[in-house]
Amino acid sequence: SASSRRRQQSRNRSTQSQDVARVSSASDYNSSELKTACRKHELYVSFQDLGWQDWIIAPKGYAANYCDGECSFPLNAHMNATNHAIVQTLVHLMNPEYVPKPCCAPTKLNAISVLYFDDNSNVILKKYRNMVVRACGCH
Amino acid sequence: SASSRRRQQSRNRSTQSQDVARVSSASDYNSSELKTACRKHELYVSFQDLGWQDWIIAPKGYAANYCDGECSFPLNAHMNATNHAIVQTLVHLMNPEYVPKPCCAPTKLNAISVLYFDDNSNVILKKYRNMVVRACGCH
């Protein structure tokens, strides 16, 4: 059905402009130009925007990035797909209603160091794992 | 807009019945009963259904499972969210148009052994990594 197609095809957001993305008809969700393959997108996160400026001293923000895009058949080599994702893609192809496509998720994540105040206003320098997306893949 | 809400909320398919899932209006996509949290779902994959029965000798199929569900704020401990996913959830909360929610993906995968014919009709026993979903999380 149109709804199930839309549901599956919209699992990964388009990287088109917001104006294009706002178009709401099912045909637009199906249009091939709206969908790009799973990849890393740049994203800078400001701790001030998150409301964390009162307890994070440094950095003021960081390049977090994010993963987005389609995990559709066939899964190319650059999509870093797992064997399970390949199988799931085939199952989805046979029965889109039953199983979703694999999703575009981080495959490599890096840490960042954060200087912050703890609950007692002591200053802590801590390495936070898995904060920066380095690579994406279909999972 | 309705389209952006639908796009974000449908990134992770509902586990409700297909009949419910077929309802296509935006309001249904927004309904809370349609969305369940990210978790592992059972899925048995038959190699015959995939058309692989001619080259895979054994097993005839396997419990592959798959991941599906919402990665919405707040991310609970059982969602096995990475630090990046927590940050991304907050950024999405602030600006749903700009960044998608994290997606529900495998966090633990197991291997299976497969007995199959190679291109020269030799029988090979090989361990295929990352074939079975053991756990899911928000990534």
Partner: antibody
Framework: QVQLQESGPGLVKPSETLSLTCTVS????????WSWIRQPPGKGLEWIGY???????HYNPSLKSRVTISVDTSKNQFSLKMSSVTAADTAVYYC???????????????WGQGTLVTVSS | EIVLTQSPGTLSLSPGERATLSCRAS???????LAWYQQKPGQAPRLLIY???SRATGIPDRFSGSGSGTDFTLTISRLEPEDFAVYYC?????????FGGGTKVEIK
């Protein structure tokens, strides 16, 4: 190069409120944390508190109930108010910058030249 | 709070001599978050050392810092006439930020 200049009344009556301002030149107040430190005559140094330009503050618990530090980004200034002063609050009051990055935190550099505030009737 | 105890209270030395100043913390100072300052009469303190051992910009290399945990030392390898002053240690890892009582280095 960054310079800090304290200003305010040199004499405050007991039980009144001490008010001082630190004007920052040569740098944006938005880049660092900013602190007040005091030194009673002939004695050691005591940290009063610090502020980030967004308004978040941290105070010395021994003074917290009487102290307010605020910031005015438009004027590149931050201020100290200390209520219910007594003779024990007589001191040279310094403002200072706190470096605040991953590799640099918590030390005071540079300092203002200091201003003597005497609490007396 | 972390109490910093400096010793000796006064150090009487001649120019050219080596000065060793001690700063002992009542509990461990995290990440060696300790600084040393020099203060001359009528002047504001001046940063010498941060991070227990890193020299601040423009500070002569005769000044050096060492130590970790609870015991820290400021060493002036060869005293110059302008080095006679009061020296303070400060910890900035725990709240409240605290200073030692100071060591006065005077001319013998």
């Amino acid at each position: 190069q960054v310079q800090l200049q304290e200003s305010g009344p040199g004499l405050v009556k007991p039980s009144e409120t001490l008010s001082l301002t630190c004007t920052v030149s040569g740098d944006s107040i938005r880049s660092y944390y900013w602190s007040w430190i005091r030194q009673p005559p002939g004695k050691g140094l005591e940290w009063i508190g610090y502020i980030y330009y967004r308004g978040s503050t941290h105070y010395n618990p021994s003074l917290k109930s009487r102290v307010t530090i605020s910031v005015d980004t438009s004027k590149n200034q931050f201020s100290l108010k200390m209520s219910s002063v007594t003779a024990a609050d007589t001191a040279v009051y310094y403002c200072a910058r706190i470096c605040s990055s991953i590799s640099c935190w918590g030390w005071f550099d540079p300092w203002g030249q200091g201003t003597l505030v005497t609490v007396s009737s | 709070e972390i109490v910093l105890t400096q010793s000796p209270g006064t150090l009487s030395l001649s120019p050219g001599e080596r000065a060793t100043l001690s700063c002992r913390a009542s509990q461990s100072v995290s990440s060696s978050y300790l600084a040393w300052y020099q203060q001359k009469p009528g002047q504001a303190p001046r940063l010498l050392i941060y991070g227990a051992s890193s020299r601040a910009t423009g500070i002569p290399d005769r000044f050096s810092g060492s130590g970790s945990g609870t015991d820290f030392t400021l060493t002036i390898s060869r005293l110059e006439p302008e080095d006679f002053a009061v020296y303070y240690c400060q910890q900035y890892g725990s709240s409240p930020l605290t200073f030692g009582g100071g060591t006065k280095v005077e001319i013998k």
